[in-house]
């Protein structure tokens, strides 16, 4: 079948990094500068991605693979293949329409990206607040108030802080 296909379509013999040039009797021609073909049998080469402005080149384009970009310091990637660069904020802030803004009371962000999330409500788990939350840190929940009553034989060690889920990007 492969041999038949080759006889029918000479372009199938053109390897990655080349294209089947209709203008030259379907000869396999190398991809021109700043273009690539990642698979064989291509009739055109794709234009290489250019990393401009806040995007910087992580991997140069080659004749067989596209360039890859990431973001300059102070920005981070969003989207598949780093299709966007978003400005960092400080911990304890979130990026809004008006720029980096401090987290409202009762919320926190321990990263330079993402949104401010509510502090854990310790009472929902029947626990008490061991360490207060801040703009940068979630509260730490401790033993339940009953465990701390006088005469309790032992104090249970504080529960580890709940790992906050990452905010959707």
């Amino acid at each position: 079948f492969e041999r038949t296909r080759s006889l029918q379509d000479p372009c199938s013999n053109c390897p990655a990094g080349t294209f089947c040039d209709n203008n030259r009797n379907q000869i396999c021609s190398p991809c021109p500068p700043n273009s690539f073909s990642s698979a064989g049998g291509q009739r055109t080469c794709d234009i290489c991605r250019q990393c401009k402005g806040v995007f910087r080149t992580r991997k140069e384009c080659s004749s067989t693979s596209n360039a890859e970009c990431d973001c300059t310091p102070g920005f981070h990637c969003l989207g598949a293949g780093c299709s966007m660069c978003e400005q960092d904020c400080k911990q304890g802030q979130e990026l809004t329409k008006k720029g980096c803004k401090d987290c409202c009371f009762g919320t926190f962000n321990d990263q330079k990206r993402g949104i401010c999330r509510p502090w854990t409500n310790c009472s929902l788990d029947g626990k008490s607040v061991l360490v207060n939350g801040t703009k940068e840190r979630d509260v730490v929940c401790g033993p339940s108030p009953a465990d701390l009553s006088p005469g309790a034989s032992s104090v249970t060690p504080p529960a580890p802080a709940r790992e906050p889920g990452h905010s959707p990007q």
Epitope: R49, K52, G53, V54, F55, C69, F75, L78, C82, S83, M84, C85, E86, Q87, L95, T96, K97, K98, G99, C100
Partner: nanobody, 122 residues
């Protein structure tokens, strides 16, 4: 093809003013949001200001009340009027399309100019 050409940079004393211009071509300017970014010596990029096609404007906190972004769709140009300049405003200023319409966010399809140097020094 898309071209963005900045001009108007230069050396200015603290407290002085400059007006940057960005001449755009190769795309439908009137329906495109535009932005300004800057890169200070040895530092990363910073999102400075943006303007929607309808004229709504946005600024980073450090330039609010000092910088004004505007556009002239008839001239395919966007401007950045910079007043009360400070030494920390020293940077290369870039004009860029702003397809995401999100503060501090650019996409891979956005286009960038080559930049114009602004130096604030006595």
């Amino acid at each position: 093809q898309v071209q963005l050409v900045e001009s108007g940079g230069g050396l200015v004393q603290p407290g002085g003013s400059l007006r940057l211009s960005c001449a755009a071509s190769g795309f439908t300017f009137s329906s495109s949001a535009m932005s300004w970014a800057r890169q200070a010596p040895g530092k990363g990029f910073e999102w400075v200001s943006g303007i929607y096609s309808g004229g709504s404007t946005y600024y980073t906190e450090s330039v609010k009340d000092r910088f004004t972004i505007s556009r002239d769709n008839a001239k395919n140009s966007v401007y950045l009027q910079m007043n009360s300049l400070k030494p920390e405003d020293t940077a290369v200023y870039y004009c860029a399309t702003w397809g995401t319409l999100r503060f501090g966010v650019w996409a891979e399809y956005d286009h960038w100019g080559q930049g114009t140097q602004v130096t604030v020094s006595s």
